[in-house]
Structure formats: structure tokens, C-alpha cells
């Protein structure tokens, strides 16, 4: 079949990095600068992606593959192939319509992206709070009070977790 196809369609012989030039008797011509073809048999080359503005070039365009972008420091990629850049916040914050805002009491975010999430409610698992939560860190649950000998624990039960601030607010 491949042999038959190549006899019928000379363009199928054009490798990646070239295009089948109808203006030149279907000769395989190299992709022009700033363009590429990632598969054989193409009749046109695709324009290379340009990583401008908040986007930085992670991988240069070649004749056979598109450029790849990432985001400038202080931003992170979103979407397929890093189609968007979103600003980072600090740990203990979330990005809202009003910019980066601190996590509400009872919630935390240990990353520079994403939303604040409620602290773990240790008592739901019958455990006690070993280390209190902060805006940046979840609580650490310890053994259940029943596992501790009487008077051995001065651990306080967790404060009830409030709803996380949802991004956007």
C-alpha cells in the first residue's frame, strides 16, 4: 500500500522538515525559516510558535518540531503546551480577583499556585492535633487520645476547619 501510495502521491516521500511544493512540481522543499513540519508528506510548513512577553523559550523551533514555551519567573504554565501563564503567589496565599490574598484562618496552601484548603480535621479520624496548622502548612495529626496514657497529652483538639477561600473570590 505504501509503495502504491508513493507512486500515486509524490508528496508522501517528503520527510519531516520539508513540504511538498506545488509551485515546483511537487518537489520536497525545506521548510522556510521560522516554520516546521513534524510529519512527512505535508503540503505546507507550520509557523513556529513565538515565546513573547511573559512566555520564555524552553526549546527552540527546529525544521521538524515547534518551539516550546514556559513562563517568566514569578509565573507558572497553564493549559496544554503552556498556552497561558498565571502569576505565582507566596505559600500561605491564593490568587483571587483582587490579587494574592492570605489564606483564611483554618486553611492553608503549601504551594505558589492553587487555592487555600482546609486543615485536616484530626478528630474525624479519632486523632488529636500534634502540630497546629498555619497558613502555609496543614496540621499534623497524632495518635488518638485513647492511645495516650492519662495525663500524658497536653494536645489541644483542632479548631473547626472553615471553608477554603475559593479562587476566584
Amino acid at each position: 500500500f505504501e509503495r502504491t501510495r508513493s507512486l500515486q502521491d509524490p508528496c508522501s516521500n517528503c520527510p519531516a522538515g520539508t513540504f511538498c511544493d506545488n509551485n515546483r512540481n511537487q518537489i520536497c522543499s525545506p521548510c522556510p525559516p521560522n516554520s516546521f513540519s513534524s510529519a512527512g508528506g505535508q503540503r505546507t510548513c507550520d509557523i513556529c510558535r513565538q515565546c513573547k512577553g511573559v512566555f520564555r523559550t524552553r526549546k527552540e523551533c527546529s525544521s521538524t518540531s515547534n518551539a516550546e514555551c514556559d513562563c517568566t519567573p514569578g509565573f507558572h504554565c497553564l493549559g496544554a503546551g503552556c498556552s497561558m501563564c498565571e502569576q505565582d503567589c507566596k505559600q500561605g496565599q491564593e490568587l483571587t480577583k483582587k490579587g494574592c490574598k492570605d489564606c483564611c484562618f483554618g486553611t492553608f496552601n503549601d504551594q505558589k499556585r492553587g487555592i487555600c484548603r482546609p486543615w485536616t480535621n484530626c478528630s474525624l479520624d479519632g486523632k488529636s492535633v500534634l502540630v497546629n496548622g498555619t497558613k502555609e502548612r496543614d496540621v499534623v495529626c497524632g495518635p488518638s487520645p485513647a492511645d495516650l496514657s492519662p495525663g500524658a497529652s497536653s494536645v489541644t483538639p483542632p479548631a473547626p476547619a472553615r471553608e477554603p477561600g475559593h479562587s476566584p473570590q
Epitope: 497553564l78 493549559g79 498556552s83 497561558m84 498565571e86 490568587l95 480577583k97 479562587s167 476566584p168
Partner: nanobody, 123 residues
Framework: EVQLVESGGGLVQPGGSLRLSCAAS????????MTWFRQAPGKGLEWVAH????????YYEDSVEGRFTVSRDNAKNSLYLQMNSLRAEDTAVYYC????????????????WGQGTTVTVSS
Amino acid sequence: EVQLVESGGGLVQPGGSLRLSCAASGFTFSSHWMTWFRQAPGKGLEWVAHIKEDGSEKYYEDSVEGRFTVSRDNAKNSLYLQMNSLRAEDTAVYYCARGGDGYSDSHFGVDVWGQGTTVTVSS
């Protein structure tokens, strides 16, 4: 080609005013949130303000709230930033950017960026 072009920057004295413009082309301007960012010398990019597709919602970074006003004219495919009571710390390159699809609903990602216009506040 999708493009954003800023203008209106310049040298202004503390307490003065400037109006920045951003001309959009190559896309349906009225379908996107639009955003202003700035980058002070030697510092990272900082979000300044953004405005909803129809102009009905506007939000500002705390330090510019009450001094800066973001607006848009969808008929002219233009975004504006009116800057009053300017301070030395407002000195920066100001960029406009387009909010990507789904902006404010599920993310705050931008996908198109202008070349910037320089604002210098100095006596």
C-alpha cells in the same frame, strides 16, 4: 496577527498623572478580560489591575487602589489605565495582557502580552 500595543508612558513628576493606552488587534477584544502588569527596575512582574469583558468588574492591586483606574472601549478595541497621584515607586514598564479563555472563572492566566510602555516618576 494577535497583537497588543501600549502607549502613553513618559516622565512625570510625583503627584502627576498619566493615561496609558493599549490597542488590541487580531482577536475579539470584547470577549476577553484584560489586565495591566508592571515591572519596576530590577524587580519581578507585578499585577496592577484587570477588567471584565464588558467593563462591569474592575479590580486593583492594593497599592494602586484609589489612584489608578482601569477602563476599556470595546468599540475602539482599546484598554486604558488612568494613573493619578503618581509616586516614585510607580516607576516601571507597564504591560497590558489578554486574559485566556476561562479567565476569572477557573484561573487568572494570560496568553497575549504587549511590548510595554515605560513610566518614570521623578522630580
